[in-house]
C-alpha cells in the first residue's frame, strides 16, 4: 500500500501526459485521480512510465474498480497488463477480439504467461466456443496454443475453425489431442479433391484410424516419412506391405533409415519377411516364412 499523502500545490494532474513520468511514486498516488486515469487510459501506453509507476496506476484502478475493470479500460491497458495477476483477470469480462489482440500484443514474443493463459480462458469461455477468428488470432501469437488445450477443451472447437490451423500449430500436439482434432479436420475438408485434401489433412493424420490410412493408400498421396512416423502405431500395424508402399510412394525407401524406430519397427515385426523382401530395402525382423501368426489380442477379447 502507498501512504496517503497530500498532493503538493500545483502538481494535481489535469490530464494524463508525459510530465507524470517525473512524478515520484507518492506524488502519482496523491496527484492522479483514478477517474481521470480511467477515462484517459488510452494515453497511458504512450507515456514511458517505469514498472514502479505502473504499479501505482494499477493500485488506483483497483481501488476504483474492486469488482474488475470494464472493457473500456481493459482494451487500453497496454503495458499495465503485465502488472495484472491471474486473480485480477478472472474478474474481467472480455468480449471483444480487438481487446484480446491488444493485450496479446503486449506479451508478443514471449511464452504464454499465467496472465495470458487466464485471459484466453476467460475470453474463450465467454464466447462459448473456439471460433475461427479467435483461433486465427491465438495461433498467430502462440503457434503452440492448440496443443496446450486438453482433449476436452479441444472438443469445443467447431470443424469450421480447423481452416485456421497451420501445420506448425500442431507440432507439439500429442496423439490424444490429434485423436480429437482429426475427425474435425476430416469433416472440415471433406469437400476437397484428393490431392488438395491430403495437403490439408496431412498434419492431422496422427489421429487417423487404420481404415482412413488404407483409403489414402489408394489415392497416390506419396506421404513423406516425417508424417508417417507421426501416425498412431495401432493404426499402422494392420497395414499390409503393399498398402504402406502405396501410401509412401517414392518415400518408401526412407523406411530403411527408420527401421529401429516406432511405428516402423513395430510394423516390421507384424509383416511376413517374404512381403518385406519385395520392397528390396533390406528390412529385417519380419515373421519368418512358414510361421503361423496368432492374434493373441483377439483370443484375450474372447476369453
Amino acid at each position: 500500500e502507498v501512504e496517503k499523502t497530500a498532493c503538493p500545490s500545483g502538481k494535481k494532474a489535469r490530464e494524463i501526459d508525459e510530465s507524470l513520468i517525473f512524478y515520484k511514486k507518492w506524488e502519482l498516488e496523491a496527484c492522479v485521480d483514478a477517474a481521470l486515469l480511467a477515462t484517459q487510459m488510452d494515453r497511458v501506453n504512450a507515456i514511458p512510465f517505469t514498472y514502479e509507476q505502473l504499479d501505482v496506476l494499477k493500485h488506483k484502478l483497483d481501488e476504483l474498480y474492486p469488482q474488475g475493470y470494464p472493457e473500456s479500460v481493459i482494451q487500453h491497458l497496454g503495458y499495465l497488463f503485465l502488472k495484472m495477476s491471474p486473480e485480477d483477470i478472472r474478474k474481467w469480462n472480455v468480449t471483444s477480439l480487438e481487446t484480446l489482440k491488444a493485450l496479446l500484443e503486449v506479451n508478443k514474443g514471449h511464452e504464454m504467461s499465467p496472465q495470458v493463459a487466464t485471459l484466453i480462458d476467460r475470453f474463450v469461455k465467454g464466447r462459448g466456443q473456439l471460433d475461427k477468428d479467435t483461433l486465427d488470432t491465438l495461433t498467430a501469437f502462440y503457434p503452440g496454443y492448440l496443443c496446450s488445450l486438453s482433449p476436452e477443451e479441444l472438443s469445443s472447437v467447431p470443424p469450421s475453425s480447423i481452416w485456421a490451423v497451420r501445420p506448425q500449430d500442431l507440432d507439439t500436439c500429442d496423439p490424444r489431442q490429434l485423436d480429437v482434432l482429426y475427425p474435425k479436420a476430416r469433416l472440415a475438408f471433406q469437400n476437397m479433391n484428393g490431392s488438395e485434401y491430403f495437403v490439408k489433412i496431412q498434419s492431422f493424420l496422427g489421429g487417423a484410424p487404420t481404415e482412413d490410412l488404407k483409403a489414402l493408400s489408394q489415392q497416390n498421396v506419396s506421404m513423406d516419412l516425417a508424417t508417417f512416423m507421426k501416425l498412431r502405431t495401432d493404426a499402422v500395424l494392420p497395414l499390409t506391405v503393399a498398402e504402406v508402399q502405396k501410401l509412401l510412394g517414392p518415400h518408401v525407401e526412407g523406411l530403411k533409415a527408420e527401421e529401429r524406430h516406432r511405428p516402423v519397427r513395430d510394423w516390421i515385426l507384424r509383416q511376413r519377411q517374404d512381403d518385406l523382401d519385395t520392397l528390396g530395402l533390406g528390412l529385417q525382423g519380419g515373421i519368418p516364412n512358414g510361421y503361423l501368426v496368432l492374434d493373441l489380442s483377439m483370443q484375450e477379447a474372447l476369453s
Epitope: 517505469t50 514498472y51 504499479d55 503485465l82 502488472k83
Partner: antibody, heavy 123, light 107 residues
Framework: QVQLVQSGAEVKKPGSSVKVSCKTS????????INWVRQAPGHGLEWMGR????????DYAQEFQGRVTFTADESTNTVYMQLTSLRSEDTAVYYC????????????????WGQGTLVTVSS | AIRMTQSPSSLSASVGDRVTITCRAS??????LAWYQQKPGKAPKLLLY???RLESGVPSRFSGSGSGTDYTLTISSLQPEDFATYYC?????????FGPGTKLEIK
C-alpha cells in the same frame, strides 16, 4: 540489425565539457529510448539518464542533473550526450544503450550497446 | 534510488563447474531485473531479462531465478568463454541501477 556507433575517444581538461555522439538505426530512432551509461576504469556501470526523441523526453540521474544534456538530431539519427564542468573522476568509458522492441516500453534493459567512448579528463 | 548488491564480488571456478551469483535489491523490484556479461574492453552483453527470460542467442546453460528483492544467475556448466564480469540491473524504477559486479576467474 540494430547498430549504435559512437564517436571516438576524447582527452579533456578539468572544467571543460565533452560531447559524445551515438548514431543509431533509422527505422527505430525516434520511437526508442536511448540510455547513457558510464564506467570508470576498474569500476562498475552507472546509469546517467535516458532520452526518448519521439516524445522529446529527457530523464537525468540526480548525480548528473545540471551537468549533463542529451539532445537528438532526427535528420542524422544521432543522439548526443554533453557533460560539462568535467573533473578527473569523470574519466570513464561512456556507452549509449538502447532498449528492446521497436517502440518505447517499460522494459529498460539493454540488448543493444554502442562500442563505448573513452573520455579522459586530465590537466 | 534502489541499491543493488551482488555476491560474491569475485569467484574462482573451473570449466564444467556450476556457478551461482546472487543479486539483492534494497526494495522489491517485481522481477524487473536483467543480467549482463562484460569482458575487458567490451560493452556489456545482455544475458537475461525479466529475472529469468533468456535473451535470444544466449546459451541455455545460463539461467535466472528469484523474486521480490533476491535474484540469482546460474551457469550450469562453465565454459572457457564464460570467464568475465557479471552485472545485474534493475529497471523497476529510475534511476536504473546496476550491481557492483561479480568477477568470475579461472581457478
Amino acid at each position: 540489425q540494430v547498430q549504435l556507433v559512437q564517436s571516438g575517444a576524447e582527452v579533456k581538461k578539468p572544467g571543460s565539457s565533452v560531447k559524445v555522439s551515438c548514431k543509431t538505426s533509422a527505422d527505430t530512432f525516434s520511437a526508442n529510448t536511448i540510455n547513457w551509461v558510464r564506467q570508470a576504469p576498474g569500476h562498475g556501470l552507472e546509469w546517467m539518464g535516458r532520452i526518448i526523441p519521439s516524445l522529446n523526453i529527457r530523464d537525468y540521474a540526480q548525480e548528473f542533473q545540471g551537468r549533463v544534456t542529451f539532445t537528438a538530431d532526427e535528420s542524422t539519427n544521432t543522439v548526443y550526450m554533453q557533460l560539462t564542468s568535467l573533473r578527473s573522476e569523470d574519466t570513464a568509458v561512456y556507452y549509449c544503450a538502447r532498449d528492446p522492441g521497436s517502440t518505447w516500453s517499460p522494459n529498460q534493459f539493454f540488448p543493444h550497446w554502442g562500442q563505448g567512448t573513452l573520455v579522459t579528463v586530465s590537466s | 534510488a534502489i541499491r543493488m548488491t551482488q555476491s560474491p564480488s569475485s569467484l574462482s571456478a573451473s570449466v564444467g563447474d556450476r556457478v551461482t551469483i546472487t543479486c539483492r535489491a534494497s526494495q522489491g523490484i517485481s522481477n524487473s531485473l536483467a543480467w549482463y556479461q562484460q569482458k575487458p574492453g567490451k560493452a556489456p552483453k545482455l544475458l537475461l531479462y525479466a529475472a529469468s527470460r533468456l535473451e535470444s542467442g544466449v546459451p541455455s546453460r545460463f539461467s535466472g531465478s528469484g523474486s521480490g528483492t533476491d535474484y540469482t544467475l546460474t551457469i550450469s556448466s562453465l565454459q572457457p568463454e564464460d570467464f568475465a564480469t557479471y552485472y545485474c540491473q534493475q529497471y523497476y524504477s529510475t534511476p536504473f541501477t546496476f550491481g557492483p559486479g561479480t568477477k568470475l576467474e579461472i581457478k
